[in-house]
């Protein structure tokens, strides 16, 4: 198969990646699965430059990213190392807050209204961003 050389319709290209920005809300797991069905993953933020790009497109709206600690340590969905990687948490976050009354803590990360990150209850229906890679992302043969 050949490599994907341009982004799908309605996706935005930036720095050899393609991004899709939702306009509706889903729980984190449903957003995660939506991206999988698109041969993509929830956005993985690896630099300040990528942070600013995503922030510009989502505006001041709570939006899921591909970062969670549902199995213990914080993990990016594509395997990018969390400990050594880019972070942009709000002050005193993540805090795994239990005071929301919804049961459990907070295991999924999202962009807040100022772009900085917060951990929240994964069931909240936030918008989300899918990301896939150009060049190495796809083996799909071109349409004839």
């Amino acid at each position: 198969g050949s490599e994907r050389t341009c982004c799908p319709v309605n996706w935005v290209e930036h720095e050899r990646s393609c991004y899709w920005f939702s306009r509706s809300g889903k729980a984190w797991a449903d957003a995660d699965n939506y991206c999988r069905l698109e041969d993509a993953h929830l956005v993985v933020v690896t630099s300040w430059e990528e942070q600013k790009f995503v922030q510009h497109h989502i505006g001041p709206v709570n939006t899921w990213m591909g970062l969670h600690d549902q199995n213990g340590p914080w993990k990016w969905v594509d395997g990018t190392d969390y400990e050594t990687g880019f972070k942009n948490w709000r002050p005193e976050q993540p805090d795994d807050w239990y005071g929301h009354g919804l049961g459990g803590g907070e295991d999924c990360a999202h962009f807040t209204d100022d772009g900085r990150w917060n951990d929240d209850v994964c069931q909240r229906p936030y918008r989300w961003v899918c990301e896939t890679e150009l060049d190495k992302a796809s083996q799909e043969p071109p349409l004839l």
């Epitope: 395997g79 990018t80 083996q139």
Partner: antibody
């Protein structure tokens, strides 16, 4: 030609461990998600686990979560399944299968090539 | 988890006749964004691994004879063999890839009458 060759099966006592391997050839291994599917004797197919092409994310059936670990070595074109705390109900033929998806960072969940399988028997 | 329910459990069809297998999913497997149904069909003969026949409910895998066809959308799907050949005697499984865990139906055994 795509080839998948499983090995590592055998007889093990309940509570024991086993590591299955799947040697892959004939395609760009690092660009393909891979999966383990099992089939108990005389029964149907059960999806066990999957891993994305770069090895960065894995998925498990509830029946094996916390006991089985899927991994891959892309430099050796090999997929693994480490099986711990084995139970009698884990007895099955274990198939390695290639995901037909187009992305190295996602699992499509449809399997276009399968190995011949390796039999795991858990019995005392 | 999505439960896949085939019907019938088994069927016997004369060679050259049509065989039809149905599969119902407990929830829709249609992804509205791309209008794809995440439903596949596999054939398994005794002592062999499964073989992918159909994916996205109706797309035939490369090399699969055109007597095999898939149809349906949402929760109801059909695999048809237009003219049963002796080599088609096998167990046929439907499988959803819409959500994880991926799940297979129990299978339908097709014999010749």
């Amino acid at each position: 030609e795509v080839q998948l060759l499983e090995s590592g099966g055998g007889l093990v006592q309940p509570g024991g461990s086993l590591r299955l391997s799947c040697a892959a050839s004939g395609f760009t291994f690092s660009s393909s998600a891979m999966t383990w599917v099992r089939q108990a004797p005389g029964k149907g197919l059960e999806w066990v686990s999957a891993i994305i092409g770069n090895g960065g994310r894995a998925y498990y059936a509830d029946s094996v979560k916390g006991r089985f670990t899927i991994s891959r070595d892309n430099s050796k074109n090999t997929l693994y399944l480490q099986m711990n705390s084995l139970r009698t109900e884990d007895t099955a033929v274990y198939y390695c299968a290639k995901d037909r998806g187009y992305s190295r960072i996602a699992v499509a969940g449809t399997f276009d090539y399968w190995g011949q399988g390796t039999l795991v028997t858990v019995s005392s | 988890d999505i439960v896949m329910t085939p019907s019938p459990d088994s069927l016997a069809v004369s060679l050259g006749e049509r065989a039809t297998i149905n599969c119902k999913s407990s929830q829709s497997v249609l992804h509205s964004s791309n209008n794809k149904n995440y439903l596949a069909w596999y054939q398994q003969k005794p002592g062999q691994p499964p073989k992918l026949l159909i994916y996205w409910a109706s797309t035939r895998e490369s090399g699969v004879p055109d007597r095999f066809s898939g149809s349906g959308s949402g929760t109801d799907f059909t695999l048809s063999i237009s003219s049963l050949q002796a080599e088609d005697v096998a167990v046929y499984y439907c499988q959803q890839s819409y959500t994880i865990p991926f799940t297979f139906g129990p299978g339908t055994k097709v014999d010749n009458k």
